[in-house]
Interface confidence: medium
C-alpha cells in the first residue's frame, strides 16, 4: 500500500520567542527515501528541514530517527519569528539512483500562526 | 454564544434533489471548517463532508461523491449541501457540525433537519 | 479508512453506577480521539478530546484515557441525564473523519 504521510494538527498558534512542534507520522519508511518539511507550496516553498543529517539552526527532530522502525518525523522550531509564520508540509521522497529524489507524498499542512509575546 | 440552523429538509422521491443550508451565528463563520454529518434512523453517525473556512478545501465520504455538493456563501453566514440523485439510504438527520479551529473535531453542532428519501 | 470499533453495544446500568465504555481503533490515532453524547432529539454534544481532555462545562464524572489503539470513556456515578448513545470519534487521520457505532448506556 502506499506510504501514508500525516499532520494532525491544522494549525498551531505560537507567542514570538518560544518554540512549537510540528507533528508528522508516516506509515511506512518504503520506498527507501528521505523526509523533508517545507514551508509554503510551489516555486515559493522554502525547505526548513530534512531528515537527512544537515544541520538546520532552530530546528530539531522530536524523536530518534536513527531508531528502526521510526515513523515520527515531527520537528521542533526553537525561538519562533513572525517570518516563520505560513503553511509548514512534511513530504516524503523516494531516492533517485543518478536522477533527483521523487516526491511521493505530502501531509496536509499545518498553519503557524505567530503571536505578538 | 455559537449557533448553527439546519433548514431545508423533507419528504423526496429517489433521484431527486434537495438543498439544505446551515446558518452560522456566534463566531467568525470565515474562520472556521465546517461539516455535514448525518444519522440514518436507528444508525450511528456518519460524517458526510467538509469544507475549509475559505472555501478552498473540499472532502466527501465515498458514499455520497459525485452526488453531493458542499458550499458555503462567507458573506451570509451559510453553509450549502446541494444533494442530487437522492437514494433510500440517504434518509437521515442531517446535522451541520463546527470544527475546532486546530484539529478535526466537532465543538458545535446544529439540532439537524431531517431528509426522508422515498417513493 | 481508520475504523472504530465501540463495545459493548448497549450498557445496562442503574444511577449511581460506574460506567465503562470502550473504542478500539483499526490503526494507531495516538491521542486524537473525541467523544460525544447523543440523546434523542438533541444534537451531539463534545465530551472529550485529545482521548483525555474534557470539553467546556462538562461534569469531571467524564474521564477519558488511552492512546494508540485503545480508548476507555468512564463515567464514575452515572446520573439520570447521562443515559444515551456515545461515540467516538477519530481526527488523526485526513478525512474520511470516522466515528465508531455508538454504546447505549441505558437505565437498568
Known amino acids: 500500500t502506499e506510504v501514508k504521510v500525516t499532520q494532525p494538527e491544522k494549525s498551531v498558534s505560537v507567542a514570538a520567542g518560544d518554540s512549537t512542534i510540528l507533528n508528522c507520522t508516516v506509515t511506512s519508511l518504503l520506498p527507501v527515501g528521505p523526509i523533508r518539511w517545507y514551508r509554503g507550496v510551489g516555486q515559493s516553498r522554502l525547505l526548513i528541514y530534512s531528515f537527512t543529517g544537515e544541520h538546520f539552526p532552530r530546528i530539531r527532530n522530536v524523536s530518534d530517527t536513527t531508531k528502526r522502525n521510526n515513523m515520527d518525523f515531527s520537528i521542533r522550531i526553537s525561538n519562533v519569528t513572525p517570518e516563520d509564520a505560513g503553511t509548514y508540509y512534511c513530504v516524503k521522497f523516494q531516492r533517485g539512483s543518478s536522477e533527483p529524489d521523487t516526491e511521493i507524498q505530502s501531509g496536509g499542512g499545518t498553519e503557524v500562526y505567530v503571536l505578538a509575546k | 454564544e455559537v449557533q448553527l440552523v439546519e433548514s431545508g429538509g423533507g419528504v423526496v422521491q429517489p433521484g431527486r434533489s434537495l438543498r439544505l443550508s446551515c446558518a452560522a451565528s456566534?463566531?467568525?463563520?470565515?474562520?472556521?471548517?465546517v461539516n455535514w454529518v448525518r444519522q440514518a434512523p436507528g444508525k450511528g453517525l456518519e460524517w458526510v463532508s467538509l469544507?475549509?473556512?475559505?472555501?478552498?478545501?473540499?472532502y466527501y465520504a465515498d458514499s455520497v461523491k459525485g452526488r453531493f455538493t458542499i458550499s458555503r456563501d462567507n458573506s451570509k453566514n451559510t453553509l450549502y449541501l446541494q444533494m442530487n440523485s437522492l437514494r433510500a439510504e440517504d434518509t437521515a438527520v442531517y446535522y451541520c457540525a463546527k470544527e475546532n479551529n486546530r484539529y478535526r473535531f466537532f465543538d458545535d453542532w446544529g439540532q439537524g433537519t431531517l431528509v426522508t428519501v422515498s417513493s | 479508512e481508520i475504523v472504530l470499533t465501540q463495545s459493548p453495544g448497549t450498557l445496562s446500568l442503574s444511577p449511581g453506577e460506574r460506567a465503562t465504555l470502550s473504542c478500539r481503533a483499526s490503526q494507531s490515532v495516538y491521542t486524537y480521539l473525541a467523544w460525544y453524547q447523543e440523546k434523542p432529539g438533541q444534537a451531539p454534544r463534545l465530551l472529550i478530546y485529545g482521548a483525555s481532555s474534557r470539553a467546556t462545562g462538562i461534569p469531571d464524572r467524564f474521564s477519558g484515557s488511552g492512546s494508540g489503539t485503545e480508548f476507555t470513556l468512564t463515567i464514575s456515578s452515572l446520573q439520570s441525564e447521562d443515559f444515551a448513545v456515545y461515540y467516538c470519534q477519530q481526527y488523526y487521520d485526513r478525512p474520511p473523519l470516522t466515528f465508531g457505532g455508538g454504546t447505549k448506556v441505558e437505565i437498568k
Open positions: 469544507i475549509s473556512g475559505s472555501g478552498e478545501i473540499i
Open positions: 456566534g463566531f467568525t463563520f470565515s474562520s472556521y471548517d
